[in-house]
């Protein structure tokens, strides 16, 4: 299953399959997730080691048993790959690292006014993988405001150095935020020239394209079909690059298919997995296990659940079958692709779905009246769980926020439905940033069921929580995916990085905002909060957040939206925007429904609604 916990001051011994430099443990974990053999990783921050060569070292590891011995190492961080973790699988990494220079091949330099502008330039350059920016206070005046665009053979820095007044980060192309745009077409009977960066075997051109999309240096590809004239080259997928970023030439060639990486697509990237099953094909590789199962789909599920399995063949040969069950061969290779593809067999083959980010139809947990005042504009995909709850009567308007917690589930505040309990009048918009982008053609979800907490009473602040079951499940994308829920009764975690988001009023007597706003707000203890609200009872099922001096807060229109906190690199839904005295007033924190206190209720309702377990626990 999915294991998300990180181990502080621990280092996994042995099992190394690759090493690289990464700026933090989260990026190291992402590289492990996308590496075909990596199950575990260990990361050495600069503070953890004197050996300059090993600082920022990210060590990717494999293990036949799925685990390795941990040794104590002060400062080291270790953890698991996020394979099998559904919507948490993403190659998108937005963080900017201050005081760090990520080294690589510098191929472009320009003057820009901010690190965000530098990141944008990198994202809009086809070859840029990461960048460094010298701030206005950099010690050498001639380098100030320099934006260096970089690449490397492996897509990660060739070295990382601690350097004051330098900020570094990665291209946001994997976040589907590139302005370049992409070529979706594939071209039959056409071969591209230029430099081959890798060669793998694939059953079709789509798999070849997806592998190209997630390969750090592939910009385009040529695939030799199973009817290519040279038998030894059939099903070969050549991943390619060029100095210019486009093929320098193409040659008409029967039984080849060529195309482009989709990494530069805006708003949508292909999933990093291949779910099609190929009849009449045998995928060769190292044998991991053989099991008898009923049907090719069960074989694929078996492969997906066995974390080291990369691909499978389900044999229908009479000698491989007993009654209704046949042999399911679970296999792997060094690069994650079959070492041999044979046609004309009595079987079907396919890939593990361990990197699919759709996951199962569940809400996400982890084991371990009121817009934003004083906030700033959010960017695309920054808060992909945020939804807008809108009511269409004669006109249509935004009333509340909400949080996507599963393919078919939204969590919001009960008071949003005060006086409007009819599910037919509601429209739920997900994967949006600007309310003005919503037109009559914009897709929306309708409500199948509104489940208001049984103890909620109108005009009282208690139990202000409601679940919405959508009529149809939503697909997950970089712009539309769920927020993980805290563990039941989560009181031990100290959250220091919390944010509230919404389209609500920017001042008490304001109006709904167009662009989704965000504000960083510290949590306040319930004791402190109770002092500020002596006329109300602040219960243990509430959580408060705000600045003593005011100025930043949620407000009308943000109700039901998320209070999220980042802990160990993972966002969790800590609160639901509920109520407060005015907006952003001095010494009047916002009050939020404490989600951890309602985990039993959420689990009960999401499970009983359609009779099957809807919860998935990454840990």
């Amino acid at each position: 299953g999915c294991l998300t916990q990180l181990y502080e001051n621990a280092f996994f011994r042995g099992g190394d399959v690759a090493s690289m430099y990464t700026p933090n443990a989260q990026y190291c974990q992402m590289r492990c997730t996308f590496h075909p053999r990596c199950l575990l990783f260990s990361f050495l921050p600069a503070s953890s080691i004197n050996d300059m060569e090993k600082r920022f070292g990210c060590f990717l590891k494999d293990s036949v048993t799925g685990t390795l011995p941990k040794v104590h190492r002060t400062g080291a961080v270790s953890g698991h790959s996020l394979k099998q973790c559904g919507h948490q699988i993403s190659a998108c990494h937005r963080d900017i690292y201050k005081g760090v220079d990520m080294r690589g091949v510098n191929f472009n330099v320009s003057k820009v006014s901010s690190v965000e502008e530098c990141q944008k330039r990198c994202t809009s350059n086809i070859r840029c993988q990461f960048f460094s920016y010298a701030t206005q206070t950099f010690h050498k005046a001639e380098y100030r405001n320099n934006c260096l665009l970089k690449y490397s053979p492996g897509g990660t820095p060739t070295a990382i150095k601690v350097l004051s007044n330098v900020e570094s980060g990665f291209s946001l192309k994997p976040c589907a935020l590139s302005e370049i745009g992409c070529h979706m077409n594939i071209f039959q009977h056409l071969a591209f020239s230029d430099v081959d960066v890798a060669r793998v075997l694939t059953p079709d051109a789509f798999v070849c394209r997806t592998i190209c999309t997630y390969h750090p240096n592939c910009l385009f590809f040529t695939f030799y079909t199973n009817v290519w004239k040279i038998e030894s080259q059939r099903n070969v997928c050549l991943l390619k690059t060029s100095e210019s970023g486009t093929p320098s030439s193409s040659t008409p060639q029967e039984n080849t298919i060529s195309g482009y990486s989709l990494l530069t697509c805006k708003r949508t990237l292909p999933e990093p997995c291949h779910s099609k099953i190929y009849p009449g094909v045998d995928f060769g590789g190292e044998e991991l296990n053989v099991t008898f199962v009923k049907g090719v789909n069960v074989c694929q599920e078996t492969c997906t659940k066995m974390i080291r399995c990369q691909f499978f063949t389900y044999s229908l040969l009479p000698e491989d079958c007993k009654e209704e069950k046949c042999k399911c061969f679970l296999r792997l290779s060094m690069d994650g692709s079959p070492t041999r593809i044979a046609y004309g067999t009595q079987g079907s083959s396919g890939y593990s779905l361990r990197l699919c980010n759709t996951g199962d139809n569940s809400v996400c947990t982890t084991k371990t009246s009121t817009r934003i005042v004083g906030g700033t504009n959010s960017s695309w995909g920054e808060w992909p769980w945020q939804v807008s709850l809108q009511v269409k009567l004669t006109a249509q308007r935004h009333l509340c926020g909400g949080s996507l917690i599963g393919h078919q589930w939204v969590l919001t505040a009960a008071h949003c439905f005060d006086g409007l309990p009819l599910q037919d009048v509601w429209r739920i918009y997900s994967g949006i940033l600007n309310l003005s982008d919503i037109t009559k053609d914009t897709p929306f979800s309708q409500i199948k069921e509104i489940i208001i907490h049984q103890n909620y009473k109108v005009s009282e602040g208690n139990h202000d929580i409601a679940l919405i079951k959508l009529q149809a499940p939503l697909n997950y994308t970089e712009f539309q995916k769920p927020i993980c829920l805290p563990s039941k009764g989560d009181t031990s975690t100290i959250y220091t990085n919390c944010w509230v988001t919404g389209w609500g009023f920017s001042k008490e007597k304001g109006e709904i905002q167009n662009i989704l706003q965000k504000v960083n707000i510290p949590l306040v203890t319930n004791e402190e909060c109770q002092k500020r609200y002596q006329d109300y009872k602040i219960t243990q099922r509430m959580v408060c957040a705000g600045y003593k001096e005011g100025g930043k807060d949620a407000c009308k229109g943000d109700s039901g939206g998320p209070l999220v906190c980042k802990h160990n690199g993972m966002w969790r839904l800590v609160g639901i925007t509920s109520w407060g005295e005015g907006c952003a007033r001095r010494e009047q924190p916002g009050v939020y429904t404490k989600v951890a206190e309602y985990m039993d209720w959420i689990l009960e309702k999401t499970q009983s609604s359609d009779g099957k377990a809807q919860m998935q626990s990454p840990a």
Epitope: M184, D204, N226, N235, G280, T345, Q346, G347, N475
Partner: antibody
């Protein structure tokens, strides 16, 4: 010239049998998956059966499973459809088609079709 | 099995018009979608493969787009020879290869 030519259609009584043939020319036949698609008069296209390269793997639409058998003779560049226990609802124009290479599975070459009429 | 639903089922348009036909899959089929044109008494002809790629010899006024569950076939400027029935077909979950029910494009 790349082409497919069907034959073997005709009038048959319910419960009877027919064998359709599809002769391929102008391309190397053996590495391609081949399919049969039918179209009842005034209706849409319905996929009937597929046979993958080398003939090792076949599959059928539920409506014909157990009654129809697809086969190929790569030495003769010919595809066959053996139809048994025919029913009135099997009346249709039957087309053979080539599936483009490596599981894109677009049917890029079609025959002109052969008509099968099942009637008493 | 995956169901393919085309809309509209019939459509009247004039020469020079821009025409769009949509096809929706009952579940995600990635880009494994093909479009065919069929004229009365003739075999179908492949127009678009892999959702958006133009088959060799097909005029560039035909284009396809979409991925996942929603796809469109667009004819940018309708010509007299384009009046026909159009079918979408998925090749993702195979077999069976399922076709849409067809869209008949008629002269207004």
């Amino acid at each position: 010239e790349v082409q497919l030519l069907e034959s073997g259609g005709g009038l048959v009584q319910p419960g009877g049998s027919l064998r359709l043939s599809c002769a391929a020319s102008g391309f190397t036949f053996s590495p391609y998956a081949m399919t049969w698609v039918r179209q009842a008069p005034g209706k849409g296209l319905e996929w009937v059966s597929v046979i993958y390269p080398s003939g090792g793997f076949t599959d059928y639409a539920d409506s014909v499973k157990g009654r129809f058998t697809i086969s190929r003779d790569n030495s003769k560049n010919t595809l066959y459809l053996q139809m048994n226990s025919l029913r009135a609802e099997d009346t249709a124009m039957y087309y053979c088609a080539r599936a483009s290479g490596s599981y894109l599975d677009a049917f890029d070459i079609w025959g002109q079709g052969t008509m099968v009429t099942v009637s008493s | 099995d995956i169901q393919m639903t085309q809309s509209p089922s019939s459509l009247s348009a004039s020469v020079g018009d821009r025409v769009t036909i949509t096809c929706r899959a009952s579940q995600s089929i990635s880009s494994y979608l093909n479009w065919y044109q069929q004229k009365p008494g003739k075999a179908p002809k492949l127009l678009i493969y892999a959702a958006s790629s133009l088959q060799s010899g097909v005029p560039s006024r035909f284009s396809g787009s979409g991925s996942g569950t929603d796809f469109t076939l667009t004819i940018s400027s309708l010509q007299p020879e384009d009046f026909a029935t159009y079918y979408c077909q998925q090749s993702y979950s195979t077999p069976p290869y399922t076709f849409g029910q067809g869209t008949k494009l008629e002269i207004k």
